[in-house]
């Protein structure tokens, strides 16, 4: 069952957790068959996904898949948020799930919950150390 | 052609795990897209997704059963297994696993032929 | 959770003649992507489900044409056209746009 559509494989609810002042890849896996679709990445501002123009990007291809990459050089702390990959493919928009990245300010790392915290305040323990998933391929 | 195929015990105990594995053929867990989903059928009731496992070993939980559930993938033998502690007799159901396609998200298109799992004393 | 309703629960039908199933839910299925992660699957009596229609109409493959399926938002419709013998058991619609994922309560189709 092989289709030729434009897949972007970002899950639902996917999470990044990441330091400021550090490099950041976020990757935007792409399945296309024949023609490379254009590809951008835009963080969302409410309701609205803002385009993100003048930002580093590149492609990475691999055999059975592309990855759009949207580079962070360093990371900085209003780069927390979310994010969205779309895809232009025969006059098709394809709009990813977004991606959230949480951005630790490292002058603040050392406010970050403490153990005990973390037990009491799960969802803390869900956006630290959950669905960060980073593929370095 | 894919296929998918459920196994494990046929009776547990009140209290016991069970361990459930999904052998599957055609696809891969390791490319990008695909993933395994378990679903149980209580006799003459409707269906109800327990847990998913992605590619990239992501794993999401039906909430009501999280505490209860692990998942886990082997990709080299081509299995996923499911175990749930303390099983209850309320637990008997037929388990099914099935394939995750992807179409801007997981949709099942392909099921096992189920196993029925009976919770008794 | 997102509850599914379908109705009716038991769909009595005649051979050759049409049959249409709701399926409603308590929450809008439109994700924030654009598309709509509604479901439907059919059971045969003593058989695993298997895969009817995914993205609210997108037929999956080797389904009949004669199945269809519409709507948008919260209401859903799963048609057949001309109801076969084949075409008895029970059909589920499925949601996969918010976690935990979630079917409807089923409906049996069955022949006059």
């Known amino acids: 069952k092989e289709s030729c559509d434009v897949q972007l494989y970002i899950k639902r609810q996917s999470e990044h957790s990441i330091l400021a002042g550090d490099p950041f890849e976020l990757e935007c896996p792409v399945k296309y068959c024949a023609n490379r679709p254009h590809v951008t990445w835009c963080k969302l501002n409410g309701t609205t996904c803002v385009k993100l123009e003048d930002r580093q990007t590149s492609w990475k291809e691999e055999k059975n898949i592309s990855f759009f990459i949207l580079h962070f050089e360093p990371v900085l702390p209003n780069d927390n948020g979310s994010y969205r990959c779309s895809a232009n493919f025969q006059s098709n928009l394809i709009e990813s799930h977004s991606t959230t990245l949480y951005v630790t300010d490292v002058k603040s790392a050392s406010e970050r919950p403490s153990k005990d915290e973390m037990a009491s305040r799960p969802w803390l323990l869900y956006r630290h150390h959950h669905h960060h998933h980073h593929h370095h391929h | 052609q894919v296929t998918l195929k459920e196994s494990g015990p046929t009776l547990v105990k009140p209290t016991q795990t069970l361990t459930l594995t999904c052998t599957f053929s055609g696809f891969s867990l390791s490319t990008f897209g695909m993933g395994v989903s378990w679903i149980r059928q209580p006799p003459g009731k409707a269906l109800e997704w327990l847990a998913h496992?992605?590619?990239?070993?992501?794993?999401r939980f039906n909430p009501s059963l999280k505490s209860r559930l692990t998942i886990t993938k082997d990709t080299s033998k081509n299995q996923v297994v499911l175990t749930m502690t303390n099983m209850d007799p309320v637990d008997t159901a037929t388990y099914y696993c099935?394939?995750?396609?992807?179409?801007?998200?997981?949709?099942?298109?392909?099921w096992g032929q189920g196993t029925l799992v009976t919770v008794s004393s | 959770d997102v509850v599914m309703t379908q109705s009716p629960l038991s769909l009595p039908v005649t051979l050759g003649q049409p049959a249409s199933i709701s399926c409603k839910s308590t929450?809008?299925?439109?994700?924030?992507?654009?598309?709509?992660?509604l479901n439907w699957f059919q059971q045969r009596p003593g058989q695993s489900p298997r895969s009817l229609i995914y993205l609210v109409s997108k037929l999956d493959s080797g389904v009949p044409d004669r199945f269809s399926g519409s709507g948008s938002g919260t209401d859903f419709t799963l048609k057949i056209s001309r109801v076969e013998a084949e075409d008895v058991g029970v059909y589920y619609c499925?949601?996969?746009?918010?976690?935990?994922?979630?079917f409807g309560q089923g409906t049996k189709v069955e022949i006059k």
């Open positions: 929450q809008s299925l439109l994700d924030s992507d654009g598309k709509t992660y």
């Open positions: 496992i992605y590619w990239d070993d992501d794993k």
């Open positions: 099935a394939h995750g396609n992807w179409d801007g998200e997981t949709y099942f298109d392909y």
């Open positions: 499925w949601q996969g746009t918010h976690f935990p994922w979630t």
